[in-house]
Interface confidence: low
């Protein structure tokens, strides 16, 4: 009969740096042997060879040595391709061409994505502001893909579209840094929010700045930090923003600045006696010395770890003193789930199978949802376990026990509740008797 080659209709979405499975399956006839199989993966547009299997053996990767087949599953009709350490340049269409006696092919799209960082906000000018002044607010978010959508709104949620200039620049890896500039005339006070949206991940990164133009009473130190937690990806750098209002004639010799852990009061970083006293926190913190005199007491925390999560207090003393606490929320995206099936061959309607969905190295703990091919949630007979590794990152394993119908698709969605990042995997079980063509 005709050789049917099946691939997912929807693009496979993969985070930069993770591994992706480009699913492809065919229907082997009875008596099929791998010696008969010619399998070619190639780039759809250029026909560049990516990986092949011929003459009964894996001919290996022709694509930067980052591809692999699933040799143990080929005989069952699983021609899927594993692409490791995904890069932006990998984005596009891959064709799976299978030839036995008949031949067939199908193309699967790879959509590459990378989450945007929590935006940083800067203000120019940033002191002695009065109602009626024009200020430039810059919102910067880094290392995302594809290009972001940027939205500004005021404190009432009203969109601000006039006087906005947004630029996006790709680095050598193809990841975008986005800088959006809003020019606005100050009222008595105001909050300005910037939202950077990754259109593929449907990930929104928010920041806001509240500007209160009126001057502080003489001597009082107003310390301001963001209301919302600062969200930082594991391994990246985070800025814990803190600002105060220096009086005219203020000198750094007057300043005592202490950053400490809110709960334990453990010292993190300090500035006193006119100089930076350095990091007391694993040598991973730094101030912005050139900005201190302007009232910027922000702290840079490098190479963020899960253990850094929590509340940090910024304490400023000049003549008077003031303090405020900012929360650091650490996050790490979950990997594309891998799906396994037990048993995985000679399946018949009425059989009970165990489908395991595994996703790795995320933080915080994931929410896991199962649904069938119609999108109906499956809640019975689901067991989900999450185990933290030594870095505090979670591996999640969710097991669904299900009685097979005539055919069925079972989808697993692993959600990072902080990043609002959803990683999907699905498996389609068809035929009678059925085999297992996984559709990751």
């Amino acid at each position: 009969g005709a050789l049917e080659v099946q691939v997912p209709e929807d693009p496979v979405v993969a985070l930069v740096g993770t591994d992706a499975t480009l699913c492809c399956s065919f229907s082997p006839e009875p008596g099929f042997s791998l010696a008969q199989l010619n399998l070619i993966w190639q780039l759809t547009d250029t026909k560049q060879l990516v990986h092949s299997f011929a003459e009964g053996q894996d001919q290996g990767s022709a694509y930067a040595n980052r591809t692999a087949l699933f040799p143990d599953l080929l005989a069952q009709g699983n021609a899927s391709l594993r692409l490791q350490r995904v890069r932006v340049a990998d984005e596009g269409s891959f064709t799976c061409f299978v030839s036995i006696r008949d031949f067939g092919s199908a193309a699967v799209s790879l959509q590459v994505a990378a989450p945007y960082s929590k935006p940083s906000m800067t203000l120019e000018p940033n002191k002695d502001l009065r109602p009626g002044d024009t200020v430039t607010i810059t919102c910067s978010s880094y290392q995302g893909y594809p290009e972001a959508e940027v939205f500004w709104q005021d404190g009432q949620g009203v969109p601000l579209t006039g006087n906005v200039t947004t630029s996006q620049m790709a680095n050598e890896q193809g990841l975008f840094d986005v800088h959006s500039i809003l020019r606005v005339v100050l009222g008595a006070n105001g909050t300005y929010s910037c939202l950077v949206r990754n259109p593929v991940l449907q990930q929104d990164a928010h920041s806001s700045v509240t500007i209160t133009p009126q001057r502080s009473p003489t001597g009082a130190v107003e310390v301001q930090v963001p209301e919302d937690p600062v969200v930082a990806l594991v391994g990246t750098d985070a800025t814990l923003r803190c600002s105060f209002s220096p009086e005219p004639g203020f000198s750094l010799a007057q300043l005592n600045l202490i950053w400490q852990l809110t709960d334990t009061k453990q010292l993190v970083h300090s500035f006193t006696e006119g100089r930076d006293q350095g990091s007391a926190y694993a040598n991973r913190t730094a101030l912005f010395p050139d900005l201190l005199a302007q009232g910027n007491a922000s702290l840079r925390l490098q190479r963020v770890r899960v253990a850094d999560e929590g509340s940090f207090t910024c304490f400023v003393s000049i003549r008077d003193f003031g303090s405020a606490a900012v929360s650091l929320q650490v996050a790490a995206p979950y990997s594309k789930p891998s799906m396994t099936l037990e048993p995985n061959k000679d399946l018949r309607p009425g059989d009970t199978v165990t489908i395991t969905c595994s996703s790795y190295r995320g933080y915080p703990e994931a929410e896991v949802f199962w649904q069938d091919g119609q999108g109906v949630p499956l809640t019975g007979n689901v067991t989900t376990s999450q185990m933290a590794n030594e870095q505090g990152l979670f591996d999640v394993h969710s097991v669904l026990r299900v009685v097979l119908g005539a055919n069925g698709t079972y989808s697993c969605l692993v959600r990072n509740p902080v990043l609002q990042q959803d990683a999907h995997g699905s498996v389609t079980i068809t035929g009678q008797p059925m085999t297992f063509p996984p559709e990751a």
């Epitope: 449907q202 949802f369 119609q374 999108g375 109906v376 949630p377 969605l413 959803d422």
Partner: antibody, heavy 119, light 108 residues
Framework: EVQLVESGGGLVQPGGSLRLSCAAS????????MSWVRQAPGKGLELVAA????????YYADSVKGRFTISRDNAKNTLYLQMSSLRAEDTAVYYC????????????WGQGTLVTVSS | DIQMTQSPSSLSASVGDRVTITCRAS??????LAWYQQKPGKAPKLLIY???NLQSGVPSRFSGSGSGTDYTLTISSLQPEDFATYYC??????????FGQGTKLEIK
Amino acid sequence: EVQLVESGGGLVQPGGSLRLSCAASGFTFSSYGMSWVRQAPGKGLELVAAINSNGGSTYYADSVKGRFTISRDNAKNTLYLQMSSLRAEDTAVYYCTRNEEFRRGLAYWGQGTLVTVSS
Amino acid sequence: DIQMTQSPSSLSASVGDRVTITCRASENIYSNLAWYQQKPGKAPKLLIYAASNLQSGVPSRFSGSGSGTDYTLTISSLQPEDFATYYCQHFWGTPPWTFGQGTKLEIK
């Protein structure tokens, strides 16, 4: 810009039939599930029927099951609601809505079309 | 089907007031809940999705919270344009995803 425009409403006698249409534009219609929501005069909202993106799965409120049929033509970017054996209690404004992704609510609604069942 | 019970069914309040509307599901809906605002003669407008996420373009005075079976819509400081009818709707399980019966918010 996402737009949903309903048509086909009007006055019909009890026991009669009517077909509502919803013309969709501004988005990839074939990628989204769709629903019909109705609102009787002075009453609340009721989701009467829903259909998935390829039309393979349909769902109905108990109050209309067996009498109403939801369907779609992805080539024409159009959603339909075939209503038969109409009753006085089916009198309502009928809204066409787009089903957003998981947990995201009904963000886009048409302006509504009024169906009046009366002798 | 899951039943959604909204309370109160009507409410009188003044501009500047803080207002809370609650919605109770007949079973756990796992935060799969949306809130809508509807003004006379108009289609409903989505305010909150996934129990607590503010829909783009909706003023920040609106907020949602809750989990399990109990959910709340809060308007922190009522504005004149907020007088309307509010509905909750669950998105758990198969359609039809039922609405609450509505809460009419009137000027005191």
